[in-house]
């Protein structure tokens, strides 16, 4: 059976296509190619007479067609108007004609696309942004890339207009991009330059650093305030409610106890119109803001009940601290047999009883800090009664 095949089937505009013919009958007078799905003299492209080996252009000939002795038809410099069906009719020597229809599709070489946006400076959690991939072309697939990755599944991302438009609902600061669109057809593909979003947001609740609360007299107080914000926030400081200065950093040299108080950082974004504040308490004191971990020691850790006594000692290098003791999560002393001495550094138990066995630890503290020792285990044993063999000395 007579058939035709397009090589290639998808053709780039400006390129060429060859309509190949298969199973061409042997005894022929000639053949004709037509534009369309049927034989129509008004749409004849070319005819070829085998006897004279002469090609005759038809009404639909554009000058870009070449017919070969094997009936194949070459069309050069194709345009999108060339897309469609082509019919070959062969005139056999028995005066019975045979026909075959083929087709091909011409696609344009795609240009470099560009992204247009309806809002390049959206406000976080408030505005939506619609990106449109330009230009609009027929038979084109539109793809989108965010951060060089294909679109994630998200209810905030919507595609429309044949995927040509990407809409971000309620943008966040993480939606800055970059965004790229890609256009594809069967013969070419092209990607846009990246586009980034300038998402306006904030300020978030400011953070004051460092996190220290306690300072010694004579130290320098240097506080810095930061609030995530776009555009960057404008900062001001208040001490105990009184405005001090409009800077991101606050510096007070050689502080005294009088500098203790509430330090407020105020952050403002003039574009969003939002304000946020954070309050930090500063305490200027001679006391150590950090109490070291105390060490606990026992005169012995295994004792005989109702017979032995034991001394537990809590050691610390810190000054101006207090000490308290704990046994089984309860504060001591808890009985007449327990005594505290030397400013609570020593816990004496005399005598030790079975109920005194267990875990002990001490805690050192001052008004601004505390720390506790590792626990120590006290074991209490009882000796067995003397063995009686039933014999009297004598």
């Amino acid at each position: 059976q007579l058939t035709t095949e397009s090589m290639p089937f998808n053709v780039a505009e400006g390129k060429e296509v060859l309509l190949l013919v298969h199973n061409l009958p042997q005894q022929l007078f000639g053949y004709s190619w037509y534009k369309g799905e049927r034989v129509d003299g008004n749409r004849q492209i070319v005819g070829y007479a085998i006897g004279t080996q002469q090609a005759t252009p038809g009404p639909a000939n554009s000058g870009r067609e070449t017919i070969y002795p094997n009936a194949s038809l070459l069309i050069q410099n194709v345009t999108q108007n060339d897309t469609g069906f082509y019919t070959l009719q062969v005139i056999k020597s028995d005066l019975v004609n045979e026909e075959a229809t083929g087709q091909f599709h011409v696609y344009p070489e795609l240009p470099k696309p560009s992204i247009s946006s309806n809002n390049s400076n959206p406000v976080e959690d408030k505005d939506a942004v619609a990106f449109t991939c330009e230009p609009e072309t027929q038979d084109t697939t539109y793809l989108w890339w965010i951060n060089n990755q294909s679109l994630p599944v998200s209810p905030r991302l919507q595609l429309s207009n044949g995927n040509r438009t990407l809409t971000l609902l309620s943008v966040t600061r993480n939606d800055t991009g970059p965004y790229e669109c890609e256009i594809q057809n069967p013969v070419s593909a092209n990607r846009s330059d990246p586009v980034t979003l300038n998402v306006t947001y904030g300020p978030d609740t400011p953070t004051i650093s460092p996190s220290d609360t306690y300072y010694r007299p004579g130290a320098n107080l240097s506080l810095s305030c930061y609030a995530a914000s776009n555009p960057p926030a404008q900062y001001s400081w208040l001490i105990n409610g009184t405005f001090q200065q409009s800077t991101q950093e606050l510096f007070i040299p050689n502080i005294t106890v009088n500098n203790s108080g509430s330090y407020t950082c105020h952050a403002n974004n003039s574009v969003t119109g939002c304000n946020r504040t954070t309050v930090k308490t500063i305490i200027v004191t001679e006391l150590s803001p950090v109490v070291a971990k105390p060490q606990i020691k026992a005169s012995k850790t295994t004792v005989t009940g109702d017979k032995d006594s034991v001394n537990l000692t809590c050691s610390t290098n810190d000054t101006g601290i207090s000490i308290r003791w704990f046994f089984k999560n309860q504060s001591l002393p808890s009985s007449e047999r327990m005594k505290l001495s030397q400013g609570n550094t020593t816990l004496s138990i005399n005598p030790v009883k079975r109920e005194d066995a267990g875990t002990y630890w001490c805690e050192v503290f001052n008004p601004i800090s505390k720390n506790q020792s590792d626990p120590i285990m006290l074991n209490v044993n009882y000796n067995a009664l003397p063995q009686e063999n039933g014999l009297s000395p004598g």
Epitope: G41, Y48, T52, I91, L95
Partner: antibody
């Protein structure tokens, strides 16, 4: 069944005009090249003109160039011959004929019964 | 004067084989297909042979065509009385850009 039926012949004075028609049936008219062939009384066959199946290609015999015009209406399955400036030597039976080879191996497989054109004063 | 040359007449008795010749040039017979037509008295011509030697369906195999160089021949074997008619050869002429016929040969079946 293939049928070709000519009409429009008759008596006309020298210099006059006439339009012949050939109604085709029984085949796909638009797929075939068509010709007019004439035969003067007692004489042999003389080819007059051919028109391709789509009407894009037309040829004439030198003896009629500029005076006779061939045309076709594929929607009406009809072939025409417009005859102007007629002469006595144009007197003949005019046949329309079908070429099944689209002109690749010109031949006439079906002929009409003919219509007589007489040019006389 | 016809472009293709045929004998004006030919004759034969029933059952005989008769040959009619047609002579042309390289611009017609030499490079194009030849057809033969039969015209019975008072009727339109009928195609007998096309493409030099091919017979349309319905034409008896008593009729055959051949071609050599710039000449063609029609042979009729087993001649019958109903074969009495005018016979024309025809071919496309590349120089004239037109179809040309021979002057015709009148075949008479004797007896």
């Amino acid at each position: 069944e293939v049928q070709l039926l000519e009409s429009g012949g008759g008596l006309v004075q020298p210099g006059g005009s006439l339009r012949l028609s050939c109604a085709a049936s029984g085949f796909t008219f638009s797929n075939y090249a068509m010709s007019w062939v004439r035969q003067a009384p007692g004489k042999g066959l003389e080819w007059v003109s051919v028109i391709s199946h789509g009407g894009g290609s037309i040829y004439y015999a030198d003896s009629v160039k500029g005076r006779l015009t061939i045309s076709r209406d594929n929607s009406k399955n009809t072939l025409y011959l417009q005859m102007n400036s007629l002469r006595a030597e144009d007197t003949a039976v005019y046949y329309c004929a079908r070429d099944p080879t689209k002109g690749y191996a010109p031949t006439f497989d079906y002929w009409g019964q003919g219509t007589l054109v007489t040019v006389s004063s | 004067q016809s472009v293709l040359t045929q004998p004006p007449s030919a004759s034969g008795t029933p059952g005989q084989r008769v040959t009619i010749s047609c002579s042309g040039s390289s611009s017609n017979i030499g490079n194009n297909y030849v057809s033969w037509y039969q015209q019975l008295p008072g009727t339109a011509p009928k195609l007998l042979i096309y493409a030099d030697s091919k017979r349309p369906s319905g034409v008896p195999d008593r009729f055959s065509g051949s071609k050599s160089g710039t000449s063609a021949s029609l042979a009729i074997s087993g001649l019958r009385s109903e074969d009495e008619a005018d016979y024309y050869c025809g071919a496309w002429d590349q120089s004239l850009n037109g179809y040309v016929f021979g002057g015709g040969t009148k075949l008479t079946v004797l007896g």
